[in-house]
Every structure is written in structure tokens, then in C-alpha cells.
């Protein structure tokens, strides 16, 4: 807390300008009117202040707006945003995408801080859904943003927003998140032709069911091994050797290097060894010839 001291003669700020640049903490407190600061916040970003000085300016705004800052002030916070706590931000009502962009710009280069996470949360809740423009903005600043959302939160993403998603935005998504995103992507890209569709849908395939993988295997897509390894194990297991061969195309040879890793390992265990041998890759661990395979799950379903 800054002590209340009288402003020295001739030091009263008539406007926010660089004459304040070397004011001591107590001088800023005594000589800068909070209402003046609020109306001239845009000027603060043209003046280099120390963090200590920024603390004083924040304190003034807090006193002026105990219920939370108006958006006209928030939009021009600049580096002062770095001084805000999540508790401060929860009092805000941010509706303009321009305001969001301005504050994310200040935080550029930093990891997503609790302040930024709170800001985004407030903004998205205020909008009701994660629309394309917002998603575009957020993933531009934070490529991992989508994967930081829960499946429940992802359910509010409209399919139209999926067009803004880049492959790197999904790098850290887990299967539960891709389960939610995949149907949206399928819907978003449904009117594209085969090869273009595959390019767009590829990053989302970690959420694809077996029937969609079977359909893709009929389209000469040549899926790479990196994508195949990210597929759901339960979706890969029912695929036949012929279907996997068609799905991977020339990349099928990569199965040998991955034979000890899921989902390849589990898939091999489900295939007849003779079928695996047709690939000529030396894959071992399939069901020996002459063995009868009982699908117990099917039996249970029938009973």
C-alpha cells in the first residue's frame, strides 16, 4: 500500500505523458488522478515504466473501479495486464475480440499464464460458444489452446470453427478430446473431395471409428505411420490386413518398425499369421494357422 502524501508543487499530472517517466512511487500516487489515467490509458503504452510504477497505476485503477474495469480501460491496459491477477480478471466483462487480441499480444512469448487462461475463459463464456474468429485468434497465439480444453468445453465448438484448426494445434490432444473434435471435423469437411478431405481430416483421425477407417482404406489415401500410430486402438483392431495395407499404401512397410507398439502390436495379435505373412514384412505374433477365433464379445451380446 502506497502512503498518502501531498503532490509536490508543479508535479500534478495534467495528462498522462512522459513527464511521469521518472516519478517516484509516492509521486505517481499523489500526483496522478485515477480518472485521468482511466481516460488516457492508451498513452501508458507509449511510456516506459518500471514494474514498480505499473503497480501504482494498477492500484489507482483498482480504487476507481472496485467492481472491475470497463472494457474501454481493459483494451488499453498493455503491459499493465501483466500485473493483473486472475481474481481481477474475473470481474471483467470482455466482449470485443480486439480487446482480447490486444491483451494476448502483450503476453506474446510467454506460456499461457493463469491470467490469460482466466481472460479467455471469461471471453468465451461471454460469447456463449467458441466461434471461428475467436478460435483463430486463440490458436494463433497459443497453438496448444484447443488441447487445453475439456471434452465438455470442446463440445461447444461449432463445426465451422474447425476450419481454423492447424495440425500443430492438435499435437497435445488426448483421445477423449479427439473423440469430440473428429465428428465436428467430419461434418466441416464433408463436401471436400477425397484427397483434399484426407489432408484436412488427417490430424483429427485419433477420434475416428472403425467404419470411417474402413471407408478411408477404399480411397487410396496412403496414411503415414505417424498418423496410424495415433489412431484409437479399438478402432484399428477390427481392420483386416487387406484394409490396413490399403490404408497405409506404400507406408505399410513401416509396420515392422512399430510392431511392438500400440496399436500395431494389439492389431497383430488379432490377425491370422497367414494374412500377416502376405505383407512380406516378417510380422510375428498373429494367430497361428488352424486356430479357431471366438469373438467372445459377440457371444456375450447374443446371449
Amino acid at each position: 500500500e502506497v502512503e498518502k502524501t501531498a503532490c509536490p508543487s508543479g508535479k500534478k499530472a495534467r495528462e498522462i505523458d512522459e513527464s511521469l517517466i521518472f516519478y517516484k512511487k509516492w509521486e505517481l500516487e499523489a500526483c496522478v488522478d485515477a480518472a485521468l489515467l482511466a481516460t488516457q490509458m492508451d498513452r501508458v503504452n507509449a511510456i516506459p515504466f518500471t514494474y514498480e510504477q505499473l503497480d501504482v497505476l494498477k492500484h489507482k485503477l483498482d480504487e476507481l473501479y472496485p467492481q472491475g474495469y470497463p472494457e474501454s480501460v481493459i483494451q488499453h491496459l498493455g503491459y499493465l495486464f501483466l500485473k493483473m491477477s486472475p481474481e481481477d480478471i474475473r470481474k471483467w466483462n470482455v466482449t470485443s475480440l480486439e480487446t482480447l487480441k490486444a491483451l494476448l499480444e502483450v503476453n506474446k512469448g510467454h506460456e499461457m499464464s493463469p491470467q490469460v487462461a482466466t481472460l479467455i475463459d471469461r471471453f468465451v463464456k461471454g460469447r456463449g460458444q467458441l466461434d471461428k474468429d475467436t478460435l483463430d485468434t486463440l490458436t494463433a497465439f497459443y497453438p496448444g489452446y484447443l488441447c487445453s480444453l475439456s471434452p465438455e468445453e470442446l463440445s461447444s465448438v461449432p463445426p465451422s470453427s474447425i476450419w481454423a484448426v492447424r495440425p500443430q494445434d492438435l499435437d497435445t490432444c488426448d483421445p477423449r478430446q479427439l473423440d469430440v473434435l473428429y465428428p465436428k471435423a467430419r461434418l466441416a469437411f464433408q463436401n471436400m473431395n477425397g484427397s483434399e478431405y484426407f489432408v484436412k481430416i488427417q490430424s483429427f483421425l485419433g477420434g475416428a471409428p472403425t467404419e470411417d477407417l474402413k471407408a478411408l482404406s477404399q480411397q487410396n489415401v496412403s496414411m503415414d505411420l505417424a498418423t496410424f500410430m495415433k489412431l484409437r486402438t479399438d478402432a484399428v483392431l477390427p481392420l483386416t490386413v487387406a484394409e490396413v495395407q490399403k490404408l497405409l499404401g506404400p507406408h505399410v512397410e513401416g509396420l515392422k518398425a512399430e510392431e511392438r507398439h500400440r496399436p500395431v502390436r494389439d492389431w497383430i495379435l488379432r490377425q491370422r499369421q497367414d494374412d500377416l505373412d502376405t505383407l512380406g514384412l516378417g510380422l510375428q505374433g498373429g494367430i497361428p494357422n488352424g486356430y479357431l477365433v471366438l469373438d467372445l464379445s459377440m457371444q456375450e451380446a447374443l446371449s
Epitope: 517517466i21 503504452n45 516506459p48 515504466f49 518500471t50 514494474y51 503491459y79 500485473k83 510467454h110
Partner: antibody, heavy 119, light 106 residues
């Protein structure tokens, strides 16, 4: 090209005076606060003085207060440091440095000019 | 505010992970910058706001910390990284620098 170029250094006797200049190019000079930072031979960096974009506000380290004067001529894109009553401990390479627009760290430095105070 | 860097010098090999610390005599939030200086050259900004990488600086450099304790890390030392590194606080006036850490070839 964005750059800063210092000049004016040299050998001077204790008690003498020297004026350093720093010519700026490649950016809007008047929009940025500027600083002088020095480095004694084999030693670390020391912030000496700073000036606001318009030149209206100045700051000095206690070690040079009353002896050094910082100024700028925005029409010539030049920063100055007038050094009077020089002492042996003022011997150093003097760098001029540009402050970023909002905070007090330096994103551009000159190559420096050596000031030697010796009898 | 006094900034104390440690170690004052260190020997390392190309490919090594190098960590330099900077301790402030009082809390400075994240108001810290790191600079690299090579002999006879001007300092060069590497990191600002304790952890933000300056544009054009290789990603092997990273900064962390807040309050009084800060760290500069070089994940895999390259031949061009042998230099002296300085921290600087911009929390309040007067601005101050650490004493420097010289990184030498082992």
C-alpha cells in the same frame, strides 16, 4: 539499418570534460527513451543515465549525479552525454542503448566508445 | 536492488546444458532481462520479462523465475554461445545489472 553509433571517447585528465555522442538510425528516435550504460575494463555493466523521448525528463545514477548531463537532439537523431569533473573511476566503455517503448530493458545497443581518465 | 549472479564463471562443453542463476535482493516480479556479451562487442538482448524470448534468439535459450530467483538456461551449448551473460532488473530505478557469468570452453 537499425543502429546506434557512439563517438567522442578518448583520453582525458582527472577533472577534465568530454562529450559523447550517439547517432541513431533506422527507427523513430523521438519515440523512444534512451540510456547510457558503461562498463569499466574487465567489469560488469552499470546504468549511468536515461532520458525520455522528448528530452523533458532525465535520470542519473548517484555515481554521476551533478557531474554528467544527458541530452538529445531529435532533429539530428542524436543522444549526448556531457561528462564534467571526470574521475579515474569513470574510465569505461560507454554504450548508448535504446529502451523498448513500454518497459525499461534495452533491445538495441551501440558498439561503445572508450573513455580513459588518467593523468 | 542488487542482483547476484552465480556462478561468476563456468566451463562447459558443446552440447552441455548450462544454467545460470540471478538472485535479486528484493522481489522484482518478472521484471528481469538477460543479455549476452562477447568480448569487444555490445550486449545483446536474449530474454525479457523473465521468460520471453527476444525475436531472432535461438530457442535453446530459455528463462524462468519470478520474485527473487531467476534462471537462464541454454539447453544445448553451441560454439557461438561462449560469452558473458548479464541479468538486469527493470522493476524500479535505478536499473541494475548482475555481475555477469562467463561461460568458457572446457
Amino acid at each position: 539499418e537499425v543502429q546506434l553509433l557512439e563517438s567522442g571517447g578518448g583520453l582525458v585528465q582527472p577533472g577534465g570534460s568530454l562529450r559523447l555522442s550517439c547517432a541513431a538510425s533506422g527507427f523513430t528516435f523521438s519515440s523512444y527513451a534512451m540510456s547510457w550504460v558503461r562498463q569499466a575494463p574487465g567489469k560488469g555493466l552499470e546504468w549511468v543515465s536515461a532520458i525520455s523521448g522528448s528530452g523533458g525528463s532525465t535520470y542519473y545514477a548517484d555515481s554521476v549525479k551533478g557531474r554528467f548531463t544527458i541530452s538529445r537532439d531529435n532533429s539530428k537523431n542524436t543522444l549526448y552525454l556531457q561528462m564534467n569533473s571526470l574521475r579515474a573511476e569513470d574510465t569505461a566503455v560507454y554504450y548508448c542503448a535504446k529502451v523498448i517503448r513500454q518497459l525499461w530493458y534495452f533491445d538495441l545497443w551501440g558498439r561503445g566508445t572508450l573513455v580513459t581518465v588518467s593523468s | 536492488i542488487q542482483l547476484t549472479q552465480s556462478p561468476s564463471s563456468l566451463s562447459a562443453s558443446v552440447g552441455d546444458r548450462v544454467t545460470i542463476t540471478c538472485r535479486a535482493s528484493q522481489g522484482i516480479s518478472s521484471a528481469l532481462a538477460w543479455y549476452q556479451q562477447k568480448p569487444g562487442k555490445a550486449p545483446k538482448l536474449l530474454i525479457y520479462d523473465a521468460s520471453s524470448l527476444e525475436s531472432g534468439v535461438p530457442s535453446r535459450f530459455s528463462g524462468s523465475g519470478s520474485g527473487t530467483d531467476f534462471t537462464l538456461t541454454i539447453s544445448s551449448l553451441q560454439p557461438e554461445d561462449f560469452a558473458t551473460y548479464y541479468c538486469q532488473q527493470f522493476n524500479n530505478y535505478p536499473l541494475t545489472f548482475g555481475g555477469g557469468t562467463k561461460v568458457e570452453i572446457k
